[in-house]
């Protein structure tokens, strides 16, 4: 069950997809990736207030217990609900290959 | 790829499974659940330092970008990698039913 998409903290403050531009050097990939030289990394960033985009029952429990015991139980966290695949041209022992990665770019986000 | 399980912050400080005892009242379930009266909730709590239990490539990217842009990109977060099912005896319009929930109790944890 994916709960409310209304952010009580104000527009753009809650868990959502952000794009961060990163070079191969930023990612620590320069020694094994040839292309792309720069990646538009999509990632999940933002707060997870009560029931906002709750991924499942566990997220709802976490919200309840965080309210009761904020020092013990953290609030739910904004993480990818699914991913977009991406290819990298990477160096191999003998040359290059084109490799697909299915878990690299966030496609959409939820709180868990 | 699940990376290192050695916690550089000291024993028990990094992302791992914790058990939190919670009553139906704590969980806000008292009006629709009859049993159990108390749940041993397993949840994922702890820090996610560099490459600790990195769930996938996305988590590794997040670590790299958090190091570069800590104010923009959060560190990876400790969340369930899988769940244990649990049954609840719940009230219905006509009486009670036994319902299985697959996404309630964390089974193991990773950083994402």
């Amino acid at each position: 069950a994916r709960n409310g998409d209304h952010c009580p903290l104000g527009p753009g403050r809650c868990c959502r997809l952000h794009t961060v531009r990163a070079s191969l050097e930023d990612l620590g990939w320069a020694d094994w990736v040839l292309s792309p030289r720069e990646v538009q990394v999509t990632m999940c960033i933002g707060a997870c207030p009560s029931q906002f985009r709750a991924a499942n029952m566990h997220a709802q429990i976490k919200t309840s217990l965080h309210r009761l015991k904020p020092d013990t139980v953290p609030a739910p966290c904004c993480v990818p609900a699914s991913y977009n695949p991406m290819v990298l041209i990477q160096k191999t022992d003998t040359g290059v290959s084109l490799q697909t990665y299915d878990d690299l770019l966030a496609k959409d986000c939820h709180c868990i | 790829a699940r990376n290192g399980d050695h916690c550089p912050l000291g024993p028990g400080r990094c992302c791992r499974l914790h058990t939190v005892r919670a009553s139906l009242e704590d969980l806000g379930w008292a009006d629709w659940v009859l049993s159990p009266r108390e749940v041993q909730v397993t949840m994922c709590i702890g820090a996610c330092p560099s490459q600790f239990r990195a769930a996938n490539m996305h988590a590794q990217i997040k670590t790299s970008l958090h190091r570069l842009k800590p104010d923009t990109v959060p560190a990876p977060c400790c969340v369930p990698a899988s769940y244990n099912p649990m049954v609840l005896i719940q009230k219905t319009d006509t009486g009670v039913s036994l319902q299985t929930y697959d996404d309630l109790l964390a089974k193991d944890c990773h950083c994402i």
Partner: antibody, heavy 118, light 107 residues
Framework: QVQLQESGPGLVKPSETLSLTCTFS??????????VGWIRQPPGKGLEWIAH???????YFNTALKSRLTISKDTSKNQVSLKLSSVTAADTAVYYC??????????WGQGTLVTVSS | DIVMTQSPATLSTSPGERVTISCKAS??????VAWYQQKPGQSPRFLIY???YRYTGVPDRFSGSGSGTDFTFTISSVQSEDFAVYYC?????????FGGGTKVEIK
């Protein structure tokens, strides 16, 4: 495995529009970094890059042909279409489509011969 | 547009010989040159990426080198299945452009 197949009319009359379709399998045009390109080869001559389209719908065209070209994709059908308007005999060629990963064109279709003649 | 000029247009050789093909770009393309092989009636096969990187599955007798404007493609010991036309292509900037091709034929 990756496969691409070009389809087209075979014969087109001068001044008409040539429509080609590339149907592919083994990869997705929703994957970041993936594109499909078109290349042609007149009989007995060399290769000429025509156009390509990327996963994000960015499009690039051969400078000399740009005004006559249209390229589009249907991600759900795994197809890329190319239209070349106002054809002349000089457009007679084998037309290939190729999978692209950034600037690599690693898998090619078998090609389809298009003859422009009245 | 960047013009790619290949030489020679035809090269006659025997199995076991070393073959070298030259490709010159009309402007600096860094190392962004690829090489393809095409046999009669077949589509081109991708061999070399970014001047010197062999693509997956390409035998190590094929190699490439160069940067800037001057590039070289080498077959260290030609096999019977290597007789074909070879094309260079710049992938530095669009529009991507090919050289005119070099036909490697049996002497």
């Amino acid at each position: 495995q990756v496969q691409l197949q070009e389809s087209g009319p075979g014969l087109v009359k001068p001044s008409e529009t040539l429509s080609l379709t590339c149907t592919f399998s083994g990869f997705s045009l929703s994957t970041y970094g993936i594109g499909v390109g078109w290349i042609r080869q007149p009989p007995g001559k060399g290769l000429e890059w025509i156009a390509h389209i990327w996963w994000n719908n960015n499009k690039y065209f051969n400078t000399a042909l740009k005004s006559r070209l249209t390229i589009s994709k249907d991600t759900s059908k795994n197809q890329v279409s190319l239209k070349l308007s106002s054809v002349t005999a000089a457009d007679t060629a084998v037309y290939y489509c190729a999978r692209m990963g950034y600037d690599i064109m690693d898998y090619w279709g078998q090609g389809t011969l298009v003859t422009v003649s009245s | 547009d960047i013009v790619m000029t290949q030489s020679p247009a035809t090269l006659s050789t025997s199995p076991g010989e070393r073959v070298t093909i030259s490709c010159k770009a009309s402007q600096d393309v860094n190392t962004a040159v690829a090489w393809y092989q095409q046999k009669p009636g077949q589509s081109p096969r991708f061999l070399i990426y970014s001047s010197s990187y062999r693509y997956t599955g390409v035998p190590d007798r094929f190699s490439g080198s160069g940067s800037g404007t001057d590039f070289t493609f080498t077959i260290s010991s030609v096999q019977s299945e290597d007789f074909a036309v070879y094309y260079c292509q710049q992938h530095y900037s669009t529009p991507w452009t090919f050289g005119g091709g070099t036909k490697v034929e049996i002497k």
